[in-house]
């Protein structure tokens, strides 16, 4: 994990001729931001959603009006870096793009109106952790000036964020095979040596000697779909590729996306397709008109001659969207559903299905206690997708297959003793005390705050709970 | 057994529309694509286009958007190309072939084709 | 769009002779093609996916290969039945193009 830092120098006219007039006027002033995009890999052409890598937007910066008859100067810029988190590891080859908008604070109906000034769009190498590399990119008459970097967050390093680094155990120097964690000297890099036979494809580890899963896969060496219902195809051996996928939440719950847009998943966020008018990571942007470029990928745009009147982009072949914004690849035929998520793997396509539906196309709707036997007298409890098994005494786990120790717990109040019994656990009791788990006194004059116990049973003999 | 039955052959007149259908029988039908090639007379094969019978989503060659529209009936398990406004380039033979929606992709049956004649 | 160039146009072979079919794309496709055979008046039949497995029911003279851009169609011994019109098809990417056939004639 780590995080992409991009920090604008300044955004103004380009040299040579025909400087572009100023972006605002004393009727119209106006305020600058900026959006990035980042995509893995260095090919345009990589069947990637868009911000596959993420996307971020800068705060506004200073609202200013041109002078008369001055030339457009460098623009105002906002405060601070723009930052995209990225959760995986960095691919080291990156495609961007960065788009200047423009915020017109004029008296607009219904508030301020956006409009895109520049997009500017590059593919680079940068391994993580190095300098602040310096770049200059030009839009038509407009320049922009910028510097970037990538840096992982701890406990990553490397030029992937991919290593791990830990305190040094000992003062003096690391482990045998173990290198300084640089710049962190006092930090070893830690020997990422996962549980022999953990899925490579499947598991991960954070600690030396563990296997952990990724979300939809179990088992010790996580090489179990958590439900592989109906996950194999009719074209036998080649179907272990389709592991059936039973994430929990989605990050669409709850739609993030504005102005009607509706939500996809991506494999790393989500991806909004906005309706036309609207523009943007969640829709946010309204007010674009053909004069603002919308149309991505050399699509073509028509109408849309002012902000009330909606443009219409015609896309190329390969394109679609309302921005064309979306490359069609072999997921664009949405062969997920339930909100399932496409993932194309080159041989084939695999879908990552939402909590409570499962196989290869999340065409299940898991039944949540249909076929689901729990072991030893459990009963089964549906709820949310995923069901759980309500365990008989002295049974646990999952499918309720395993001995549970009934006093591990620590379940008999007041100092009473637990003794684990065939049928549960029997506690005994404390002087002073009685119940099924000692949890009430005995008052002094004999009587209990309960009713009396049962015959045979003097208050602190040994009870069973059932 | 898989089976893609379509409808017989077309002769029809410049400017008019013909419905080219396609019965699927012997494999869930929503589990699998629907593609559509075009073979005119000593010709190669051309993709028209495929849709996704579960969603209804289509996607088509640019070559053939605007005439020809491919829809499905999920109760008939049937897929239906429809072409509009026809010219006597689109005299053809229009085959219907499945995929698998999710593995290999091969377009492992086709139909026994339909040719549609178009003259005056 | 991804062009398919198929080669050759045509062959003369004998029965019992090995024939290759080639098939070269303008970008490299990951295995994401076929193979398909059509008789004079039939559909086409598929005989190959994914650039080596052989459909059900198609014979074992019948093999596939390549990687990338470049793919190959190997009939080991070819029979009468053999004697058709063979066509490779990408769909790595849409829209799927097939490549401009070849036709198999005995000699």
């Known amino acids: 994990a780590g995080v992409f830092e991009l920090q604008i120098h300044s955004f103004g006219p380009g040299p040579g001729p025909g400087a572009p007039r100023s972006p605002c006027s004393a009727r119209l002033p106006c305020r600058l931001f900026f959006r990035v995009c980042l995509k893995p890999g260095l090919s345009e052409e990589a069947a990637e959603s868009p911000c596959a890598l993420g996307a971020a937007l800068s705060a506004r910066g200073p609202v200013y009006t041109e002078q008369p008859g001055a030339p457009a100067p460098d623009l105002p810029l906002p405060d601070g870096l723009l930052q995209v988190p990225f959760r995986d590891a960095w691919p080291g080859t990156f495609s961007f793009i960065i788009e200047t908008w423009r915020e017109e604070l004029g008296d607009q109906i219904g508030g301020p109106a956006w409009s895109l000034l520049a997009r500017v769009a590059g593919r680079r190498r940068l391994a993580a952790g190095g300098p602040w590399a310096r770049d200059i990119q030009r839009a038509g008459a407009w320049e922009l000036r910028f510097s970037y970097r990538a840096r992982c967050e701890p406990p990553a390093v490397g030029t992937a964020c991919t290593r791990l680094c830990r305190p040094r155990s000992a003062p003096s120097r690391c482990g045998p095979g173990l290198r300084p964690c640089a710049p962190l000297e006092d930090e070893c890099e830690a020997p990422l040596v996962c549980r022999a036979g953990c899925s490579p494809e499947h598991g991960f580890c954070e600690q030396p000697g563990e296997c952990r899963c990724l979300e939809g896969w179990t088992g010790p060496l996580c090489t179990v779909p958590v439900s592989t219902s109906s996950c194999l195809s009719p074209r036998g051996p080649s179907s272990a590729t389709t592991g059936c996928l039973v994430p929990g939440p989605g990050p669409c719950d709850g739609n993030p996306c504005a102005n009607g847009g509706s939500c996809s998943e991506t494999p790393r966020s989500f991806e909004c397709t906005c309706p036309r008018g609207f523009y943007g990571l969640r829709c946010e942007v309204s007010g674009v008109t053909c004069a603002d470029g919308p149309c991505f990928n050399g699509g073509l745009c028509v109408g849309g001659a002012d902000p009330d009147s909606a443009y219409i982009c015609h896309c190329p072949p390969g394109f679609q969207g309302s921005n064309c914004e979306k490359r069609v690849d072999r997921c664009s035929l949405q062969p997920c559903r339930n909100g399932g998520l496409c993932l194309d793997l080159g041989h084939a396509l695999r879908c990552r299905c939402r909590a409570g539906f499962a196989g290869p196309r999340c065409e299940h709707d898991l039944d949540d206690c249909a076929g689901r036997a729990c072991a030893n007298g459990g009963t089964c409890v549906e709820g949310g997708g995923a069901h759980r098994c309500s365990c008989a005494l002295g049974f646990g786990g999952r499918d309720c297959r395993e001995r549970a120790d009934p006093c591990a717990a620590r379940p008999c109040a007041h100092g009473g003793r637990c003794y684990a019994h065939f049928s549960g656990l029997v506690c005994a009791c404390a002087p002073g005390y009685m119940g099924a788990r000692c949890e009430f006194p005995v008052h002094p004059d004999g009587a209990s705050a309960l009713p009396a116990a049962p015959p045979g049973l003097r208050p602190g003999d040994p009870q069973r709970y059932l | 057994e898989v089976q893609l039955v379509q409808s017989g052959s077309e002769l029809k007149k410049p400017g008019a529309s013909v419905k080219v259908s396609c019965k699927a029988s012997?494999?869930?039908?929503?589990?699998?694509?629907m593609n559509w090639v075009r073979q005119a007379p000593g010709q190669g094969l051309e993709w028209m286009g495929i849709?996704?019978?579960?969603?209804?989503?289509?996607i088509y060659n640019h070559k053939f958007k605007g005439r020809f529209v491919l829809s499905v009936d999920k109760s008939s398990n049937t897929a239906y190309l429809q072409i509009s406004s026809l010219k006597a380039e689109d005299t053809a033979v229009y085959y219907c072939?499945?995929?698998?929606?999710?593995?290999?992709?091969?377009?492992?049956?086709w139909g026994q084709g339909t040719t549609v004649t178009v003259s005056s | 769009d991804i062009q398919m160039t198929q080669s050759p146009s045509s062959l003369s072979a004998s029965v019992g002779d090995r024939v290759t079919i080639t098939c070269h794309a303008s970008?490299?496709?990951?295995?994401?093609m076929g193979w398909l055979q059509q008789k004079p008046g039939k559909a086409p039949k598929g005989l190959i996916y994914?650039?080596?497995n052989l459909e059900d029911g198609v014979p074992s003279r019948f093999s596939g290969s390549g990687s990338g851009a470049d793919y190959t169609l190997t009939i080991s011994s070819l029979q009468p039945e053999d004697f058709a019109d063979y066509y490779c098809?990408?769909?790595?990417?849409?829209?799927?193009?097939f490549g401009g056939g070849t036709k198999v004639e005995i000699k």
């Open positions: 072939a499945r995929q698998d929606s999710l593995l290999d992709y091969a377009m492992d049956y």
């Open positions: 012997g494999y869930t039908f929503t589990d699998y694509y």
């Open positions: 849709i996704n019978p579960y969603s209804g989503v289509t």
């Open positions: 970008q490299g496709i990951s295995g994401n």
């Open positions: 994914h650039g080596a």
């Open positions: 098809v990408q769909y790595a990417q849409f829209p799927y193009t």
